[in-house]
Each structure stands twice: as structure tokens, then as C-alpha cells.
């Protein structure tokens, strides 16, 4: 029978910048109960507070809901590990809630073959931001990337879109059966997980050159921009 | 409408006790952070107990450590202080007030009239 | 226990003049956790600044904070009615704590 090994916090993730959610990993045991708080301090502040909820991240976890999250604060956390023979201390983890956002998927992915009388075919792709984010406020720029791929093939085709709502794709295997996703990330902070595929079957008669490739912005009042692959590569962010 | 009512002050002799009550309204009371301050006579402002909105550790001023209690019921929007031991020195109008977020050292945006409790023999 | 002084003590002034109190810390201060209330006579407090120099929801902009370390003020740029009152500076780094008041008085 021992003192409990050291915990480690190692992760904490915000949804939205307005609440969020630290892990740990316990240490060893030591062979009896061992009980686990996390205290924290804002910087600055010469006072220690407990978690406030430590039930809405499931096991090992605190969650500081809206009340307790103040964006451009550090949070310095600490957990502590005691039963009967000790106790053990996780090292310090200092928490900016800016660079740890990791939204949730984009929404409402729409996948359309387009195929204008006067123009070449294309696969529009559309999609919703995540509904936690308020854009409007301008705390956040979203970035998006889409990736698909032809069903049966084992290479996904990234494409880094910027902060755009919806994107155009020429280069495609006509009769070919896509999955097309989205996902999304903030300025600072983490890619979101990706969205549910959407599955598009395209045509027999789709052909287009497969050097170039036909991005729309909605921004640009529904002017379009043709951009090479090159352009398209340099444009992608991992 | 925002507010706070404070009851339960009155006439107590030295040595006695007083349990004051605070009743929130028109907020989401269990977003914040929630104190009492009192202010003596003619006297400025004085923090005396406060805890942040889940009812977690309770913090106090060394003049009232182990005498005074605070409490809150989250359900009723209530807070409560439970004062033991007067002296004459606690006589004074106490506020219930809010912090703006959800910890108790806060800045204090929301105070109530203030509850009088005199401690005389 | 950090303990906040205020200065002047009181300030006679007239309506429409620029008020400035003072207000000094017994140690460093992060500017995240300084506020500044007015009281009026017969009234409760009432939040003008919090976090140094951020106003309250519904305080006029003749109301500025400002300040850093130990050292922190309140400027009022245009003195109203209203404000011939009791202002009171309050720390919350750690167990918070109200400075003694500084009174402003009409001249």
C-alpha cells in the first residue's frame, strides 16, 4: 500500500470559448481509494478555487461551465491525488481558453452536382458552421477544410476553404460514387472532428480538365475565381 | 427586474445570534458568485463572507472566522448568514450582493437595500 | 490581506470640474481584479468600474479607470449632481477587500 502515483491533466478543450473541460490521467493507485480534486487559480489572483463540476466531463474531468470562463485569463490548475498513506500532485497546467478550442463539426452539409447549360459541370458543396459558435460577435474566424474521395479508393483529396460557407469542385471521376465531409477550425485552436460523410454520385457524362479546379466565395457577391492546383496545394493548411 | 432582498437584522444582545436571509430575482441566480458586505455606521465597506455559485468552499473575513456561516439554497434563490457569538463591532447594515461571474471574488454588481443588525446590551 | 488606501480623503469640488481619486495598493494588483463603486447618500453602492478601467453596464462615459501594479484611479471628467457621493476602490486578486472611501463634496 502506497501513496497514489502523480496524475497528469492532458487535455482541455472549449467548444465555443464560452465553457470547457479538462481531463487527467490518474497515477497508480497505490492498492486503496483514492479520492481526486483540481484546484485552479485565474493569473493574477492570490486565491485557490476547487473545480466547479466535475460530473458534466464524465470520469477524471472538470468543467468549467459559462459562469467560470473568462476568455484572455490564464487559469493555472493543478490536481491533487490523496488516499490513506498520501498524497501526489500533477505538475501546474496553465490554461489560456483561447488556444484550446475545438468546435463541433460544421452542419447541414449539401452536396450538389450542378450542371449549367453554359458552363462546365460541377460538385457544389455547402455547409453550416457549428451552432455553439457565434460568429456575429467576430471572436471568431472559422477556417474550414473539405476532404473526399471516390468510395472503394483509400486516399482522401483535401481542399483547405478558407473561411467560406461553400466551395466548387471540378476535378472528379465521372461515375463515380463520392463521400464528401467537412470540418472546421478556429484561428487558434484545434481541427473539429469531421462531419458525417454525405454521398454523391456522380454522373457518367461529368468531365472536366483536371488541372484546374473552380472555387466561388460568397463573399466575392458570387464572383468566381479560378485557381490551379498549385494555388490549391500551396492553400492547404495541415 | 434585477434585485436582491435582505431580511432576518434586528436587536440582538452580545453573545447572541441572527440568521440572515437574501432572496434573488429576475437573474439566474446560480450563475453567480454570491457575498455579504456590511458597512458599521457612518463607517466605509466591509467584505465579510462570500462563495462561488456551486456552493463550493466558503471564504470569510478573519473578523467573523468561526462565528459567522454562509450558506446558500440555489433552488429558493436564497443566501443565507448565520451569525453566532455578536459583538458589538458586527452592528451594521449588511448587503447581500452579486458578483458578476460565477466566483465570489468578483466585482460586485448587484446590491441589495441592506439588512440592519445591532448588537447592544 | 491586501489593504487598499484612498486619496484624498475628501475632495471639494464644483458641478461640470474633472475629479481624480486615488487609490493605492499594499501590493501588486493584476489590473483583471480592481473596482470602483459610488455611494450615494442614504443609497446602496452602485459598480462604476471593474477590471481597472471597464464601466459598468449603464455607467456614462465621464467615468474612466485606470492604473496598474499598486497605483489605480477613477477620473471623473465632468462632476454631476449625483456625483457628490462616497467612492469606495475594491480589490478581488484574493479575498476582497474596499478601500476607506474618498468623499466628494461640493465646493
Known amino acids: 500500500q502506497l501513496p497514489p502515483g502523480k496524475p497528469e491533466i492532458f487535455k482541455c478543450r472549449s467548444p465555443n470559448k464560452e465553457t470547457f473541460t479538462c481531463w487527467w490521467r490518474p497515477g497508480t493507485d497505490g492498492g486503496l481509494p483514492t479520492n481526486y480534486s483540481l484546484t485552479y487559480h485565474r493569473e493574477g489572483e492570490t486565491l485557490m478555487h476547487e473545480c466547479p463540476d466535475y460530473i458534466t466531463g464524465g470520469p477524471n474531468s472538470c468543467h468549467f461551465g459559462k459562469q467560470y470562463t473568462s476568455m484572455w485569463r490564464t487559469y493555472i490548475m493543478m490536481v491533487n491525488a490523496t488516499n490513506q498513506m498520501g498524497s501526489s500532485f500533477s505538475d501546474e497546467l496553465y490554461v489560456d481558453v483561447t488556444y484550446i478550442v475545438q468546435p463541433d463539426p460544421p452542419l447541414e452539409l449539401a452536396v450538389e452536382v450542378k450542371q449549367p447549360e453554359d458552363r462546365k459541370p460541377y460538385l457544389w458543396i455547402k455547409w453550416s458552421p457549428p451552432t455553439l459558435i457565434d460568429l456575429k460577435t467576430g471572436w471568431f474566424t472559422l477556417l474550414y477544410e473539405i476532404r473526399l474521395k471516390p468510395e472503394k479508393a483509400a486516399e482522401w483529396e483535401i481542399h483547405f476553404a478558407g473561411q467560406q460557407t461553400e466551395f466548387k469542385i471540378l476535378s472528379l471521376h465521372p461515375g463515380q460514387k463520392y463521400l464528401v465531409q467537412v470540418r472546421c477550425k478556429p484561428d487558434h485552436g484545434y481541427w473539429s472532428a469531421w462531419s458525417p460523410a454525405t454521398f454523391i454520385q456522380i454522373p457518367s457524362d461529368f468531365t472536366m480538365n483536371d488541372e484546374q479546379k473552380l472555387i466561388s466565395e460568397e463573399d466575392l457577391g458570387g464572383e468566381q475565381k479560378l485557381i490551379s492546383e498549385e494555388d490549391l496545394h500551396h492553400h492547404h493548411h495541415h | 427586474e434585477v434585485q436582491l432582498v435582505e431580511s432576518g437584522g434586528g436587536v440582538v444582545r452580545p453573545g447572541g445570534s441572527l440568521r440572515l436571509s437574501c432572496v434573488g430575482s429576475g437573474f439566474s441566480f446560480d450563475d453567480h458568485g454570491m457575498n455579504w458586505v456590511r458597512q458599521g455606521p457612518g463607517k466605509g465597506l466591509e467584505w465579510v463572507s462570500g462563495f462561488n455559485w456551486n456552493g463550493g468552499s466558503t471564504n470569510y473575513a478573519e473578523s467573523v472566522k468561526g462565528r459567522f456561516t454562509i450558506s446558500r439554497d440555489n433552488a429558493r434563490n436564497s443566501l443565507f448568514l448565520q451569525m453566532n457569538s455578536l459583538r458589538a463591532e458586527d452592528t451594521a447594515l449588511y448587503y447581500c450582493v452579486r458578483g458578476r461571474s460565477g466566483w465570489f471574488n468578483d466585482a460586485f454588481d448587484v446590491w441589495g437595500p441592506g439588512t440592519m443588525v445591532t448588537v447592544s446590551s | 490581506e491586501i489593504v487598499l488606501t484612498q486619496s484624498p480623503g475628501t475632495l471639494s469640488l464644483s458641478p461640470g470640474e474633472r475629479a481624480t481619486l486615488s487609490c493605492r495598493a499594499s501590493q501588486t494588483i493584476n489590473s483583471n481584479y480592481l473596482a470602483w463603486y459610488r455611494q450615494k447618500p442614504g443609497q446602496t453602492p452602485r459598480l462604476l468600474i471593474y477590471?481597472?478601467?471597464s464601466r459598468a453596464t449603464g455607467i456614462p462615459d465621464r467615468f474612466s479607470g485606470s492604473g496598474s501594479g499598486t497605483d489605480f484611479s477613477l477620473t471623473i471628467s465632468r462632476l454631476e449632481p449625483e456625483d457628490f457621493a462616497v467612492f469606495y476602490c475594491?480589490?478581488?486578486?484574493?479575498?476582497?477587500?474596499f478601500g476607506p472611501g474618498t468623499k466628494v463634496d461640493i465646493k
Open positions: 477590471g481597472t478601467s
Open positions: 475594491q480589490q478581488y486578486a484574493g479575498l476582497p477587500t
